[in-house]
Interface confidence: low
């Protein structure tokens, strides 16, 4: 038996073409940048810029490279051993609980609150109550002060795999 297609992004149309580089599996596994042939005898290289594998594996297909969505910038391209790294454009961020899209950062804090954290690719601006210093989370009240903030500078990549 050979291991079948696994989760996220497997691209059958990128199956090995005869000209692709082959080597032999080690203990039934192929190295990063390769996938295993269906008969389990060969390791076949992934196609640069099209698909990849990050670990020793027995995948029948390499994983399909992520294409950055509109509203994202590509921090680093896809190689045979690493997926594309995408990050939200300036002025937008990606929340953990809604990773599928970049959301616009708020332009200011609600009334009675002050900004203590800038917009980054992975977080909205951070607001605290003037008096208590308690952080604000949740929905933004309809009325906002016109406190504007400049988008934060990206500090580290927000990697997506699929």
């Amino acid at each position: 038996e050979s291991a079948l297609i696994t989760q996220q992004d497997l691209a059958p149309q990128q199956r090995a073409a005869p000209q692709q580089k082959r080597s032999s599996p080690s203990e039934g596994l192929c190295p990063p940048g390769h996938h295993i042939s269906e008969d389990g005898r060969d390791c076949i290289s992934c196609k640069y810029g099209q698909d990849y594998s990050t670990h020793w594996n027995d995948l029948l297909f390499c994983l399909r490279c992520t294409r950055c969505d509109s509203g994202e910038v590509e921090l680093s391209p896809c190689t045979t051993t690493r997926n594309t790294v995408c990050q939200c454009e300036e002025g937008t961020f990606r929340e953990e609980d809604s990773p599928e899209m970049c959301r616009k950062c708020r332009t200011g804090c609600p009334r009675g609150m002050v900004k203590v954290g800038d917009c980054t690719p992975w977080s909205d601006i951070e607001c605290v109550h003037k008096e208590s210093g308690t952080k604000h989370s949740g929905e933004v009240p309809a009325v906002e002060e016109t406190v504007t903030s400049s988008p934060g500078t990206p500090a580290s990549p927000c990697s997506l795999s699929g």
Epitope: S2, T6, Q7, Q8, D9, A11, P12, L29
Partner: antibody
Framework: EVQLQQSGPELVKPGASVKISCKAS?????????LNWVKQSHGKSLEWIGY????????SYNQKFKGKTTLTVDKSSSTAYMEFRSLTSEDSAVYYC????????????WGTGTTVTVSS | DVLMTQTPLSLPVSLGDQASISCRSS???????????LDWYLQKPGQSPKLLIY???NRFSGVPDRFSGSGSGTDFTLKISRVVAEDLGVYYC?????????FGAGTKLEK
């Protein structure tokens, strides 16, 4: 609505061949999906025959059905075909085409089923 | 090939009952990527099978929350919290992590 419409029932003689079809609609046929074929003998469980990847015609077969079946597609009509050769009574069954998503291995859409009866 | 053994083969129930179906694999079906490709399908009389649960415990879209899947390694369970008439039919577990993917023999849920 995603649908897989299969061809009608077939009554064939032992030793003959049969080719059944599965027309896909409601999604892009050449997207990242497989067309699988599954056999269900009367009152029995389900057996995976193989898949074809419509984008490039890539196939994979269950060893049990290798040499017995050939899977093909016609991209222009979004139709998949399964040909069975040298039929015996053991091949009498309902055959389903199913769509397999290539990022999570499951069959999310099933065809209507084609009954093949092998009898002299 | 890996053998998928379902128990019981027949499960008589009354509407409103809880039903539990077991599926045991002859060897671990955890894939090398850490995922377990164990799915459940329901085939109602005269119909094509339909996907209920994928990857052990994920309900497919439109599947009522009275269906739940659990398990790991070699032992898996499908539970129906309160059986309704439309749940009657044959339930198949399916192991999709290796070629050939294989189905269990089926469990007939009947009144």
């Amino acid at each position: 609505e995603v649908q897989l419409q299969q061809s009608g029932p077939e009554l064939v003689k032992p030793g003959a061949s049969v080719k059944i079809s599965c027309k896909a609609s409601g999604y892009t046929f050449t997207d990242y999906y497989y067309l699988n074929w599954v056999k269900q003998s009367h009152g029995k469980s389900l057996e995976w025959i193989g898949y074809i990847y419509p984008n490039n015609g890539d196939t994979s077969y269950n060893q049990k059905f290798k040499g017995k079946t050939t899977l093909t597609v016609d991209k222009s009509s979004s139709t998949a075909y399964m040909e069975f050769r040298s039929l015996t009574s053991e091949d009498s069954a309902v055959y389903y085409c199913t769509r397999g998503s290539n990022w999570i291995w499951y069959f999310d859409v099933w065809g209507t089923g084609t009954t093949v009866t092998v009898s002299s | 090939d890996v053998l998928m053994t379902q128990t019981p083969l027949s499960l008589p129930v009354s509407l409103g009952d809880q039903a539990s179906i077991s599926c045991r694999s002859s060897q671990s079906i955890v894939h090398s990527n850490g995922d377990t490709y164990l799915d459940w399908y329901l085939q109602k009389p005269g119909q094509s099978p339909k996907l209920l649960i994928y990857k052990v415990s994920n309900r497919f879209s439109g599947v009522p929350d009275r269906f739940s899947g659990s398990g790991s390694g070699t032992d898996f369970t499908l539970k129906i919290s309160r059986v309704v008439a439309e749940d009657l039919g044959v339930y198949y577990c399916f192991r999709g992590s290796h070629i050939p993917p294989t189905f269990g023999a089926g469990t007939k849920l009947e009144k």
